[in-house]
Interface confidence: medium
């Protein structure tokens, strides 16, 4: 027991937070500001990461932790771990080559961010348009059809889904 | 080059409506947003609100309730409606291009000096 | 709302000095604060964004610092150009704010 521990590295004795101090005879030293370590055992400190620009900080980095990005208001993240900042679009619409478009007919978009999507294909799973589709909305499937005859219980169809206002976050 | 040009009245009653038109040269509001601010000796610079280049618009929750912003893009043009004007708002009304590298104010049109009074 | 503090209104300065023009935020805002100056009769000018990144064509006498809630823009070398307003402003969270400003004067 005693050789197998002689023979383990002692930087493995360094946790999260510290890295392995080879200019000082292998102490675990703490990291230093604006850095981190993640696991235990490092040789080096990796430097947090800093939200500049149109990015703003979600969290601060820690010993043990790199800093989180998200972006300033009117901007969204892009990419994994908010690599990027887009513009928003306003609902309805997708942001193209060439700024935000309209969704085209069939399509929509709730959000801000992403892509228009096709509108759901009711008569795929047998049922019928209940609530017409916009830019802003998906349709709503209703019963099939046949489900409609006389004597069937009625469907009250939902409200119209207001558009939030953009007020302030 | 870059630049905002507001058109305002001027002269506005108490109560009444304050619309100023702000035209942009120099780059597409295709790409970018325009804010809105304001200045008067009392108060400072106030940031009332912003429409983005896909036409969504945030704003301030001190003037949400009378408040709103639009625009043309093929004529390049952003425009400003505020209603139910008091003396309070007197004040110089700027609007400021947005750039892409942050949500702030890179040029700023020369300002059109609105006077609230009867 | 998030308040920005310009404790100092005005500021006296000599041609070749250096002086250090100070905000505060009310709340950690990281590094998302810009800086203007302006003067008398013009529109507001962006000199910083990012607490530390000169805007394309400003000189480099200017520079920015700070994060969390200290910021300090500092004119090395003022020249009488220089001599105008300075604002601040931050944009983490709407809505975006300004402080009061500090007027740069001559001694």
């Known amino acids: 027991f005693e050789r197998t521990r002689s023979l383990q590295d002692p930087c493995s004795n360094c946790p999260a937070g510290t890295f392995c101090d080879n200019n000082r005879n292998q102490i675990c030293s703490p990291c230093p500001p604006n850095s981190f370590s993640s696991a235990g055992g490092q040789r080096t400190c990796d430097i947090c990461r800093q939200c500049k620009g149109v990015f703003r900080t979600r969290k601060e980095c820690s010993s043990t932790s790199n800093a989180e990005c998200d972006c300033t208001p009117g901007f969204h993240c892009l990419g994994a771990g908010c690599s990027m900042c887009e513009q928003d679009c306003k609902q309805g619409q997708e942001l193209t080559k060439k700024g935000c478009k309209d969704c085209c007919f069939g399509t929509f978009n709730d959000q801000k961010r992403g892509i228009c999507r096709p509108w759901t294909n009711c008569s795929l799973d047998g049922k019928s348009v209940l609530v017409n589709g916009t830019k802003e909305r998906d349709v709503v499937c209703g019963p099939s059809p046949a489900d409609l005859s006389p004597g069937a219980s009625s469907v009250t169809p939902p409200a119209p889904a207001r558009e939030p206002g953009h007020s302030p976050q | 080059q870059v630049q905002l040009q507001e058109s305002g009245p001027g002269l506005v009653q108490p109560t009444q409506s304050l619309s100023i038109t702000c035209t942009v040269s120099?780059?597409?509001?295709?790409?970018?947003?325009v804010h809105w601010v304001r200045q008067s000796p009392g108060k400072g610079l106030e940031w009332l609100g912003v429409i983005w280049s896909g036409g969504s618009t945030d704003y301030n929750a001190a003037f949400i309730s009378r408040l709103s912003i639009s625009k043309d893009n093929s004529k390049s043009q952003v425009f400003f409606k505020m209603n139910s004007l008091q003396a309070d708002d007197t004040a110089i009304y700027y609007c400021?291009?947005?750039?892409?590298?942050?949500?702030?104010?890179?040029?700023w049109g020369q300002g059109t000096s609105v006077t609230v009074s009867s | 709302d998030i308040v920005m503090t310009q404790s100092q209104k005005f500021m006296s300065t000599s041609v070749g000095d250096r002086v250090s023009v100070t905000c505060k935020a009310s709340q950690n805002v990281g590094t998302n604060v810009a800086w203007y100056q302006q003067k008398p009769g013009q529109s507001p000018k962006a000199l910083i964004y990012s607490a530390s990144y000169r805007d394309s064509g400003v000189p480099d006498r200017f520079t920015g610092s700070g994060s969390g809630t200290d910021f300090t823009l500092t004119i090395s070398n003022v020249q009488s150009e220089d001599l105008a307003e300075y604002l601040c402003q931050q944009y983490n969270s709407y809505p975006l704010t300004f402080g009061a400003g500090t007027k740069l004067e001559l001694k």
């Open positions: 400021a291009r947005n750039p892409l590298t942050a949500t702030v104010m890179d040029y």
């Open positions: 120099g780059f597409s509001l295709i790409s970018y947003g």
